[in-house]
Interface confidence: low
Amino acid sequence: DSSKWVFEHPETLYAWEGACVWIPCTYRALDGDLESFILFHNPEYNKNTSKFDGTRLYESTKDGKVPSEQKRVQFLGDKNKNCTLSIHPVHLNDSGQLGLRMESKTEKWMERIHLNVSERPFPPHIQLPPEIQESQEVTLTCLLNFSCYGYPIQLQWLLEGVPMRQAAVTSTSLTIKSVFTRSELKFSPQWSHHGKIVTCQLQDADGKFLSNDTVQLNVKHTPKLEIKVTPSDAIVREGDSVTMTCEVSSSNPEYTTVSWLKDGTSLKKQNTFTLNLREVTKDQSGKYCCQVSNDVGPGRSEEVFLQVQYAPEPSTVQILHSPAVEGSQVEFLCMSLANPLPTNYTWYHNGKEMQGRTEEKVHIPKILPWHAGTYSCVAENILGTGQRGPGAELDVQYPPKKVTTVIQNPMPIREGDTVTLSCNYNSSNPSVTRYEWKPHGAWEEPSLGVLKIQNVGWDNTTIACAACNSWCSWASPVALNVQYAPRDVRVRKIKPLSEIHSGNSVSLQCDFSSSHPKEVQFFWEKNGRLLGKESQLNFDSISPEDAGSYSCWVNNSIGQTASKAWTLEVLYAPRRLRVSMSPGDQVMEGKSATLTCESDANPPVSHYTWFDWNNQSLPYHSQKLRLEPVKVQHSGAYWCQGTNSVGKGRSPLSTLTVYYSPETIGRR
């Protein structure tokens, strides 16, 4: 309605004598700003005067002056929006209706607010959920329709008069919609809280009691049970009787059914609060409890462990592990059902009692072959001794023992022989199934554990065999000790270190790489002629005539081996020089004459020089000196000189005679 002023505030506010009231309020005037505000207590409209009568609690005028007695009541609003009020302290006679008389330039309005002030602080109100179940978290709410900035309060929770240790969350509201103080407590009630009193206590800022509200908790829970047994320790012997009684200590709502369980399984036809077990057997040993149900669900008692004692039953032996490997550890376990547990054990190996073995377990840290056999045991407790069971078999497995490689051949073995070896062993479990040989070769194994080496090599030094079952055991290697003729025979020059010159001292060595047997003889030969029988061949002063092809031989009792032919080369200066003439030493003028410088040299002559009868060198440097046409003046004695890398040599004089031709004689 556009002709109305619009207000928002709580409809009724609650307080008590001496407290205060805070009235949240907003408004919207029809036109313009607020010019006048009067707060009436229980205002009544006077038709005669066309004004409101009543107690004026607060009055503001255009000049803004407020009488001093009005300080108890405060207008906290403004001229266009806020109309919030505070009364502090508030008194019992403030109860009733508050009238807010608002005037703008052209419009007027009276807004009414109810105020309820009690003589004493009024109690808060506890709100509970419709149903509370044990162990399910619930929220308890305590609500008080009061809040004021000038009067702080607190709400505290008590259980059976004792402050609750759970943390409560307190919230306040001072809005135009609502004014309240609320405390919320999250709480997981147990069955033992059923019927207990919960209090929400209103206190002032100093903790002084103002008022409270109380409720009684109705906690729904499954039946709570106690079980009693005779005898109290629940330990009996076969044939004894046992009585168990189930007592309900609490149930909400009332219980409806009762049953008994053994090891979690329901016992048939047992629906009373007493369970009688007559002449019990060992099979009745176990965990017993009673179960009682109501609408919430089933409740169970604690378990009673009924132990029916009996003498040990026939025992069995468990072996960890069989078959066992020699050297490994083995554990034997004697298994016998008995109550109480056996206190003593007797162990047997192949029917013979094992001394000093009285424990449930027998541990052998290092198994040996003789440990194999049948193991059995007897268990004993306070009620008697059990029977010996069938026992268990221990199989001890081990690698082949004392493996040896045996040479079957007569000794010594020679290179090229056929050698037979066998692989022998002392014992084995499991049986030997194969053999291995080292080193590997293209050899025959004509039968299991036998090796045949055809055409044995000189370098076949050692052979080892292994006998194998699940493992292989290697024998120590045996030496074949193959005998052979000397190998890799060669001639080696010891001195001189450089090339051999005529006149040098020369030593040749006859080398070989190996020989078995080691005792050897040496032979040197040149062109099929025996030169010596030592490992070295020596020349004090070598001559060109010593050059040639040399071989050495080395022999032992198996055979002899020759080196490759080795060429001995002697270097020497040109020697035995002479000048030969062609066609002869007498030549007719006009013909041709060729002089040749012949020599013996190593390396060959590299340079020739020619000389005449005056020892005058001629401008010719080849081996042949050609005169064409020859003249009478060429007659005379000639000689030559040859040079190589070693040195020089010269020839004796050779005379050439050139005679006149018939024509020349005829002209004279």
Epitope: V325, G327, S328, E436, S473
Partner: nanobody, 127 residues
Framework: AVQLVESGGGLVQPGGSLRLSCAAS????????IGWFRQAPGKEREGVSC????????NYADSVKGRFTISRDNAKNTVYLQMNSLKPEDTAVYYC????????????????????WGKGTLVTVSS
Amino acid sequence: AVQLVESGGGLVQPGGSLRLSCAASGFTLDHYHIGWFRQAPGKEREGVSCISNSGGSTNYADSVKGRFTISRDNAKNTVYLQMNSLKPEDTAVYYCAAGRWYYDGSRYCPPGAMDYWGKGTLVTVSS
């Protein structure tokens, strides 16, 4: 003289590492499978790890799997045990041993098949 000599033991904090060496003299190690064993005070000797003569097959006790590594250097005639993430329960005297038998990697070295044993080296794991 034929002998095996262990070295590399000592005091180490939990979580630490050690490298044990087993050096052979007087014989060629590459003909032999090598096992590491240990014996704690008052306890039985137990197999720790095993390596074949070629180094191609290895085996470890469950208690050391993923922490210990066995290796060998045949050229140096030496076998090693690298021990990481050590625990107080690894405290023991560690022995190496050499033996010759068919080894397929699926078992521990059987102590009964060992031809040569070392004198041991003490490993103490303590904070």
